[in-house]
Amino acid sequence: QQQTLPKPFIWAEPHFMVPKEKQVTICCQGNYGAVEYQLHFEGSLFAVDRPKPPERINKVKFYIPDMNSRMAGQYSCIYRVGELWSEPSNLLDLVVTEMYDTPTLSVHPGPEVISGEKVTFYCRLDTATSMFLLLKEGRSSHVQRGYGKVQAEFPLGPVTTAHRGTYRCFGSYNNHAWSFPSEPVKLLVTGDIENTSLAPEDPTFPADTWGTYLLTTETGLQKDHALWDHTAQNLLR
């Protein structure tokens, strides 16, 4: 019986959300000794890389210099060691942002609330879209999808300090083409709570993270990036 190699990791650097006309690199990490990597886009072969020397390289990069809506979609990669191919990677949803318009994000009852208070975000965009996405900065990349003619509601329910952080929203023209990001809304959750165990505050990226959707590229964080992206994309799907 023909065996297959473990699937590779796939992720985008600096981020899977790419402003139009900006560059992005799709990374595929397989095994040392892999002689060929293939990148597939929407099910078809998109690019091939043959690392040299293969025994010293376990990762390849596919560079996209100018992001646009035609390049946005689902990517996967595979690699080959000898005649043996790997399982395909998870799907990477590459999203083009800064398309068309900018939504407005607001939060009720306000940006500062008491622990346990019910909070709802509202994302509004007057142009033709019916899908909206709410994202919270931080490696766990909380993504919610909402629908509405010009506005979507995102009820967070009773909040805890784990909900603290900076939120932005996007209008989505399709799964892979998003609007400009809204202005950020910082949610502050205060409250002295007796005998209540709360989740810790979510780690967040530096303040400039969202200007260009950059993730901090620290050594050893590549797999975190892949998981971060994958978590968000699963929620998108």
């Epitope: 009720h108 306000g110 500062e112 346990g116 709570i193 209540t196």
Partner: antibody, heavy 116, light 107 residues
Framework: QVQLVQSGAEVKKPGSSVKVSCKAS????????MHWVRQAPGQGLEWMGG????????SYNQKFKGRVTITADKSTSTAYMELSSLRSEDTAVYYC?????????WGQGTTVTVSS | EIVMTQSPATLSVSPGERATLSCRAS??????LHWYQQKPGQAPRLLIK???QSISGIPARFSGSGSGTDFTLTISSLEPEDFAVYYC?????????FGQGTKLEIK
């Protein structure tokens, strides 16, 4: 319909404490925070603090911190505001108000007079 | 804390005329600004929420505008029952703060 009914007027000595109640009806008590706002005679409105009844989270105006305690009893849909170490300048009407974004419903007010 | 400043302190207007009340925040509060009306011996009543959103049961002559630091409450044609004290409130940050009030009196 939403109603907030407060306890009756109180006359207190300086240095003592007062506890005012606010019974809510007409909505799910735990789904909204309850706040306390006071108004001294001839003066404006002053926020004292609020509570989230579902988990007991509170937020206080630093001006009152240490003297004010806000609690809630979900079983009776009642919020309480206790103010200690009373002084003459605490003479005021005390209101409870539901925060439904803004303060959309208010109690009728409780007059607390601090006098020796 | 965010300081809310209302002007004028007292506004004298005749019934049927238009009244414009101002409220300024010491820092930007976006549209997290609410307006209340209070009559003697009564609790405050919500008039406008989030700077411009109308409230069910409140007459259409009451409207609000503004964003950031400067806000306005407009009463298009004053009725006798509109003479009262009006307060704006910061709903953005704790401590939640109120303006000192504008007394609307009959001219």
């Amino acid at each position: 319909q939403v109603q907030l009914v407060q306890s009756g007027a109180e006359v207190k000595k300086p240095g003592s404490s007062v506890k005012v109640s606010c019974k809510a009806s007409g909505y799910t008590f735990s789904e909204y925070t309850m706040h306390w706002v006071r108004q001294a005679p001839g003066q404006g409105l002053e926020w004292m603090g609020g509570i989230s009844p579902n988990i007991g989270g509170t937020s206080y105006n630093q001006k009152f911190k240490g003297r004010v305690t806000i609690t809630a009893d979900k079983s009776t849909s009642t919020a309480y505001m206790e103010l200690s170490s009373l002084r003459s300048e605490d003479t005021a009407v005390y209101y409870c108000a539901r925060r439904g974004g803004s303060f959309d419903y208010w109690g009728q007010g409780t007059t607390v007079t601090v006098s020796s | 804390e965010i300081v809310m400043t209302q002007s004028p302190a007292t506004l004298s207007v005749s019934p049927g005329e238009r009244a414009t009340l101002s409220c300024r925040a010491s820092q930007s509060i976006s549209d997290y600004l609410h307006w209340y009306q209070q009559k003697p011996g009564q609790a405050p009543r919500l008039l406008i929420k989030y700077a411009s959103q109308s409230i069910s049961g409140i007459p259409a002559r009451f409207s609000g505008s503004g964003s950031g630091t400067d806000f306005t409450l407009t009463i298009s044609s004053l009725e006798p029952e509109d003479f009262a004290v009006y307060y704006c409130q910061n709903g953005h940050s704790f401590p939640l703060t109120f303006g000192q009030g504008t007394k609307l009196e009959i001219k």
